[in-house]
């Protein structure tokens, strides 16, 4: 048996991220003998479920089964049949379902109940579907990126796994942007916190971490846009909204009922003398930026320092990974490079937003118009949120790394969630074993 590797015992796990705008299924795998090591779990597949987020199925719950079928069947194909029964399946729903629960706990429970029944029909070890808290979403995103960057490893390497990895053990902060909420999570310099609600303590691999986290519900990119529209239509003189966040020449009719459907626009709701209004784009970054800033209340802060809306935010510390929609939007706009300064990003946004809609449609012919039309707003919103909301500066901008994947695994909360629920992150540093499964015998 000289030079013959022992057969690897591989384990799998499945996490469904039921987001506000869509659901994605992630399949992870790892060598069973190394499950307490750091950095051994990696993503083998992402399956994006066709259709909107699960909260949209509230009136058609009997279709949730067919909605999830293709991705669940894909998991059945990818994972060896012999492993099906021991493969855990978790579904975590985020801010879209938090908002539905705010409107009706009964409806949210009904959706989750049907999701659970649908997922129980598959041969996997279904572990439940639940709405995770904003704190969990922030914490698990932070765990994911630092796990994948090797920040929890006690072994110092002479090489870097990823371009922006430094060999120190300083953790990265996590910036997550979804459709309905956004999270900021990092280890501040000062261990004492003024706001216990925003404090988390972890012991991971023998080291203590005091982490700050906050999730801003209604400040994901889609809900922020609804908020902005609801705010701006209040002062419109008629059913035409001249909007600087959309390209010149862009036109779209919006139903007032759609605008006021979300709890996020309640604070701006008023009786309007029309049922519909038309957005007419004028494409002006500076004016768009000013309009977005009005969503952040910075006039009130009961702490030494706040982000916005009276929420405590300690001074920023270290490098940050910005993922999910932070990455998707900035990647589309070609602004993820480490070399692009904040000033250059602003300049590029000004240029992009001012481009006529017909020109934009021609330049990006393959992109769905609904998404294409919103990149000017989304890019402006990201800049406003990072600079005015979280107080990044032109100098600290270079500490933001826009990350899609790390080592082939998507940055996001799902991996951290699974690592936690499968007890794969030990509190203490595991003792290194003399022989690992890959040792030749």
């Amino acid at each position: 048996t000289q030079n013959k590797a022992l057969p690897e015992n591989i384990k799998y796990g499945i996490v469904l991220d039921a987001g506000s705008s869509h659901t994605s299924l992630y399949i992870y795998k790892w060598p069973a003998e190394k499950e307490n090591d750091t950095g051994v779990v990696h993503q083998v597949e992402e399956c994006r479920v066709k259709g909107p987020g699960i909260s949209k199925y509230v009136q058609k719950v009997n279709e949730i089964g067919i909605y999830l079928t293709d991705c669940m069947e894909r998991a059945r194909e990818v994972i060896p049949r012999s492993q099906h029964q021991e493969t855990p399946v978790y579904l975590g729903a985020t801010a879209g379902m938090r908002l539905l629960r705010m409107e009706s706990e009964e409806l949210a429970d009904r959706v989750l109940d049907v999701v659970e029944r649908s997922l129980s029909n598959y041969p996997f070890d279904f572990q439940g579907a639940r709405i995770i808290t904003g704190q969990e979403e922030g914490a698990y995103g932070w765990i994911t990126i630092n796990y994948l960057l090797g920040k929890f490893s006690q072994k110092t390497r002479w090489f870097s796994i990823v371009p922006y990895e430094t060999n120190n053990q300083e953790t990265f902060g996590a910036l997550d942007l979804g459709g309905a909420s956004t999270q900021i999570t990092f280890v501040p310099q000062n261990q004492t916190t003024e706001s216990p609600d925003n404090a988390l303590q972890f012991r991971l691999y023998g080291k203590d971490y005091n982490v700050y986290t906050h999730s801003f519900l209604c400040y994901g990119k889609d809900q922020a846009l609804w908020q902005k529209l609801a705010k701006d239509i209040q002062v419109a003189s008629n059913e035409i909204l001249r909007d600087p966040c959309f390209h010149p020449g862009y036109k779209k009719v919006v139903n007032v009922s759609d605008l006021y459907k979300t709890p996020c626009t309640k604070r701006f709701e008023m009786t309007l003398p029309f049922q519909q209004f038309e957005i007419q784009g004028i494409g002006n970054y500076q004016q768009c930026h000013q309009s977005v800033l009005e969503l952040f209340n910075t006039s009130y802060c009961p702490y030494s320092q706040c982000a916005f809306n009276g929420i405590f935010l300690p001074p920023l510390q270290g490098d940050f990974g910005a993922f999910s929609a932070f990455y998707f939007v900035m990647n589309f706009l070609n602004l993820t490079s480490e070399k692009v300064s904040q000033e250059k990003v602003t300049e590029m946004m000004k240029k992009f937003c001012s481009q006529p809609w017909e020109e934009i449609k021609t330049s990006y012919a393959g992109v769905k118009e609904k998404y294409l039309s919103e990149y000017c707003f989304s890019g402006t919103y990201i800049l406003s949120l990072l600079l005015q909301g979280y107080h990044f500066t032109a100098d600290s901008w270079e500490h933001i790394h826009f990350i899609g994947k790390i080592q082939g695994s998507d940055a996001g909360w799902t991996l951290g969630y699974m690592l936690n629920l499968t007890n794969m992150i030990p509190a203490e540093q595991p003792l290194s074993t003399p022989l690992s499964h890959s040792t030749y015998v």
Epitope: S21, G51, E73, G96, G179, D258
Partner: nanobody, 124 residues
């Protein structure tokens, strides 16, 4: 526009079988999901079985193990094989073809087409 034409309904004894067909014509590239719904007298619409573009299926608990949905993409036709029929399966059966919208505003379905329905009666 997509047109859906159902056939294969009729009168059958309990324990018997029927095969319903639904032929789609027109602008069918936009269709991903096809399904059979039914409406019993005095009741609401009930989703019986559905099939995705990839051929994956889903069934109502009441018909699992008795009914089979299948799809022949070359003929643009979806079938519902109904075995071990019971009196409670009596209904008008409708073929439905649709695709979901990816957007969080407006309707859930981007396209939504329905057939005229075919009557299935299970009686001795």
């Amino acid at each position: 526009e997509v047109q859906l034409l159902e056939s294969g309904g009729g009168l059958v004894q309990p324990g018997g079988s029927l095969r319903l067909s639904c032929a789609a014509s027109g602008d069918i590239f936009s269709i991903n999901y096809m399904s059979w719904y039914r409406q019993a007298p005095g009741k609401g619409l009930e989703l019986v079985a559905a099939i995705t573009g990839r051929g994956n299926t889903n069934y109502a608990d009441s018909v699992k193990g008795r009914f089979t949905i299948s799809r022949d993409n070359s003929k643009n036709t979806v079938y519902l094989q109904m075995n071990s029929l019971r009196a409670e399966d009596t209904a008008v059966y409708y073929c439905n073809a649709w695709d979901y919208s990816d957007y969080d505003e407006g309707p859930l379905r981007e396209y939504d087409y329905w057939g005229q329905g075919t009557q299935v009666t299970v009686s001795s």
